[in-house]
Amino acid sequence: SGVFQLQLQEFINERGVLASGRPCEPGCRTFFRVCLKHFQAVVSPGPCTFGTVSTPVLGTNSFAVRDDSSGGGRNPLQLPFNFTWPGTFSLIIEAWHAPGDDLRPEALPPDALISKIAIQGSLAVGQNWLLDEQTSTLTRLRYSYRVICSDNYYGDNCSRLCKKRNDHFGHYVCQPDGNLSCLPGWTGEYCQQPICLSGCHEQNGYCSKPAECLCRPGWQGRLCNECIPHNGCRHGTCSTPWQCTCDEGWGGLFCDQDLNYCTHHSPCKNGATCSNSGQRSYTCTCRPGYTGVDCELELSECDSNPCRNGGSCKDQEDGYHCLCPPGYYGLHCEHSTLSCADSPCFNGGSCRERNQGANYACECPPNFTGSNCEKKVDRCTSNPCANGGQCLNRGPSRMCRCRPGFTGTYCELHVSDCARNPCAHGGTCHDLENGLMCTCPAGFSGRRCEVRTSIDACASSPCFNRATCYTDLSTDTFVCNCPYGFVGSRCEFPVGLP
C-alpha cells in the first residue's frame, strides 16, 4: 500500500491556445486530469489501472502551481494504491480548458483539450522527487513525482505491513525494510521477551520486564544464584535448594546441635584445656592453682592442705608456710619428735613403732587419713564427677550430684530421653540437651510423629529429565530443579539451546 504523488509546478501556455490551435475565450482556464497505469512500452488510452485524479482550475494560460497539501491534498496530487508497487508505471497528464464550472468529462467539448503528455518508466519507492519537464509546440509543463509507502507499510515495494507497538505482544519499532527493531531491553522474534538483569541465573531466575531478576522457588539473591536452605537450618548451608549441610562442629537435621562446644563457647577459664565430650558437653582440665567446672576458681596454695600432722598453713606471696604443732617439724610438719608413747594417732588410729622406737606410723580407720589420722578423707579432691556434676562426701564414700541430662556414678552417662521410644509411627529419636526430637517418616508430623499428614510430594518422582526433586515442607508440594537445557515445573520441556 502506498501513494504515487505528483507535484505540478508550472504550466506555460503563452498564447492561450487549445491543442487544436484555437484560442481560449477570454483565456485558457486550465485544470488537469491525471491517469496512472501499469507500464506500457507505448502508452495507450485505456483503463487507468493504478488510479486517476483531477484538479480544480489552477490558473489561466501560464501560471505556477502553489504547494497546497492543506486543502485536501490538492498539490501534490495523491494517487493511492492498495497493492505491491511493481517498480514501473505509465503516466498520462492532460491539461484541459474549462469554459464553465462543470469539469466532468461528459460536460466538456472534445476540443477543450489543451495538451496531453505521456511518460513511462521505472520508479523505485523513495522520498526523493523526480523532476521532469515536457514541452509541446505551444505548451510546457514542469512537474515532479515520487512513490512513497502509506503509513505502516515498508519495503522496496511497500508490501510489508508493520505497526510499531509497545505492549505484551511486542516492544518494537519498524525498520525501513519492515523488519522489527526491538526497543531497548527486549528480544525475541516479536521483541516480546525481556532481557533480564545482567548475570541473572539462566535456569533459576527469570523476568517479566527488562533488567529484572525474579527467582524461581528455592533460589534467592540479586541474581537468583543462591539456594535457599531447609527451613529452620541454623548452622548450615546448601548447594541445591532445601538442603542443610552442617558447618563444622554442628550436627542434627537443622544443624542446630552443637558438637564443638569448646570452640564455639570457650567455656574453660584460666588457660584450662577444654575437651568436647558430646553434644553441648565438655570437660575442663585445670592448670595448677585453679578449680571449678570451668576452672573459674583460683586455688589458694593452702587449699591443698599441704601441712601434715595438724600443722596450720599460712599463705605467702611466694607460696605458703606450715606452722607445726609441738612434736613436729619439717617443711610440711612431716617429721615427728613423738613416739607411740605420746599417743600421736587421732580418731582411733593405731600406732606402730618404727626404727626401734625412734619413729612411728599411724594406721588410720576408714574415713581418716594423714600421718596422725587427723584428717577426714575428702574423696572429692580428685574432681571425679564429669559433665559439671557436683561431688558430695558421704561418710566412707563419695557421691556425684549430676546436672540435668546426665547420670551414672560419675555423671558420665548422657540420659537418653529416647530410651522409652517416644516417637510414634517409626519416627527416629534424637537426644538433645534439654529433651529429644523426633524425625518423622513420610506422611507423619508433630512433636512425636503422632499427626498423619500428606505423603512426601517427591515420593512419586514427578520430575523429568534427571531433575532433582525437593519437597517444600511448608506447602507439602515439590519443586523440580532442572538440569541445563530443560524448563517447566516438572522440567519436562527441552529448551532450544544455541
Epitope: 505491513l161 505497526k163 507497538r165 509497545n166 505492549d167 527469570y206 517479566s208
Partner: antibody
Framework: EVQLLESGGGLVQPGGSLRLSCAVS??????????WGWIRQAPGKGLEWIGD???????YYNPSLKSRVTISVDTSKNTFYLQMNSLRAEDTAVYYC?????????????WGQGTLVTVSS | EYVLTQSPGTLSLSPGERATLSCSGQ??????ASWYQQKPGQSPRLVIY???KRPSGIPDRFSGSNSGDDATLTISRLEPEDFAVFYC?????????FGQGTKVEIK
C-alpha cells in the same frame, strides 16, 4: 490440532468466587509464541476481554476487573486458570479461554467451547 | 479507556450481496485490527487478523482494511453460512478491546 477445554463453571452465590480451568491439548502451553487469555460474554451481550498470561507467569488484566481477577498457569498440567472474587450478578456470563498468537498481532486463533457461570442467590 | 464503535448495529442483506462492516476507534489505523465471527451458541472464530490477513480455512471472500480511524471488514458475496455477529478487536497498550458487534442477518 490444539484444543482448549474450560471447566469449573456453574452457580455461584453473590460475593463468592470462581476458579475456572482451561486445559490445553495438542500443543504445549510453554510455547513462547502464545499468550493464553480469558474472555467473557454476558447473555445477549458482546465480548469482554478479562486478561491473559504467558508461560513464564507474566499476567495482564483488564483494568476494570484487575482488583478481582487472578490468572495463573501450571505448565506441568498444560493448564491455565481464572480466579475471580467478590462476584456479582453482572458477572453472569459464558467464560471462554483462548489462545492469542504473537504471529497474528495478538489475534485469538483458538477458542474453548465456553463455560457458563451464573451468579445468583 | 479505549473504545471501538461498530456500525451499523445490524446489516440486513441477501445471499450474494456485498457486506461492509465498519469499526472506528481513535487512530485505529496505528493498531492491528482483528475480526471475529460468532454464530448463535458457538464460540467466536477469527476471520481477519493484522488488518487484512486471513487465517487458514477462511475463504477469500472475507477481506479487511484499516487506516486512519476506521477498520473495515468486507464480505464480497454473502453465503448462507456467513450470517452471524461480527466483532472487531484491537489492543490498546496491554488491554484487549472489542467492539459491540454488528449482526449480519438475512433480509
Amino acid at each position: 490440532e490444539v484444543q482448549l477445554l474450560e471447566s469449573g463453571g456453574g452457580l455461584v452465590q453473590p460475593g463468592g468466587s470462581l476458579r475456572l480451568s482451561c486445559a490445553v491439548s495438542g500443543g504445549s502451553i510453554s510455547s513462547s509464541s502464545y499468550y493464553w487469555g480469558w474472555i467473557r460474554q454476558a447473555p445477549g451481550k458482546g465480548l469482554e476481554w478479562i486478561g491473559d498470561i504467558y508461560y513464564t507467569g507474566s499476567t495482564y488484566y483488564n483494568p476494570s476487573l484487575k482488583s478481582r481477577v487472578t490468572i495463573s498457569v501450571d505448565t506441568s498440567k498444560n493448564t491455565f486458570y481464572l480466579q475471580m472474587n467478590s462476584l456479582r450478578a453482572e458477572d453472569t456470563a459464558v467464560y471462554y479461554c483462548a489462545r492469542q498468537a504473537l504471529a497474528m498481532g495478538g489475534g485469538s486463533d483458538k477458542w474453548g467451547q465456553g463455560t457458563l457461570v451464573t451468579v445468583s442467590s | 479507556e479505549y473504545v471501538l464503535t461498530q456500525s451499523p448495529g445490524t446489516l440486513s442483506l441477501s445471499p450474494g450481496e456485498r457486506a461492509t462492516l465498519s469499526c472506528s476507534g481513535q487512530r485505529l489505523g496505528d493498531k492491528y485490527a482483528s475480526w471475529y465471527q460468532q454464530k448463535p451458541g458457538q464460540s467466536p472464530r477469527l476471520v481477519i487478523y493484522e488488518d487484512s490477513k486471513r487465517p487458514s480455512g477462511i475463504p477469500d471472500r472475507f477481506s479487511g482494511s484499516n487506516s486512519g480511524d476506521d477498520a473495515t471488514l468486507t464480505i464480497s458475496r454473502l453465503e448462507p453460512e456467513d450470517f452471524a455477529v461480527f466483532y472487531c478487536q484491537a489492543w490498546d497498550r496491554d488491554t484487549g478491546v472489542f467492539g459491540q458487534g454488528t449482526k449480519v442477518e438475512i433480509k
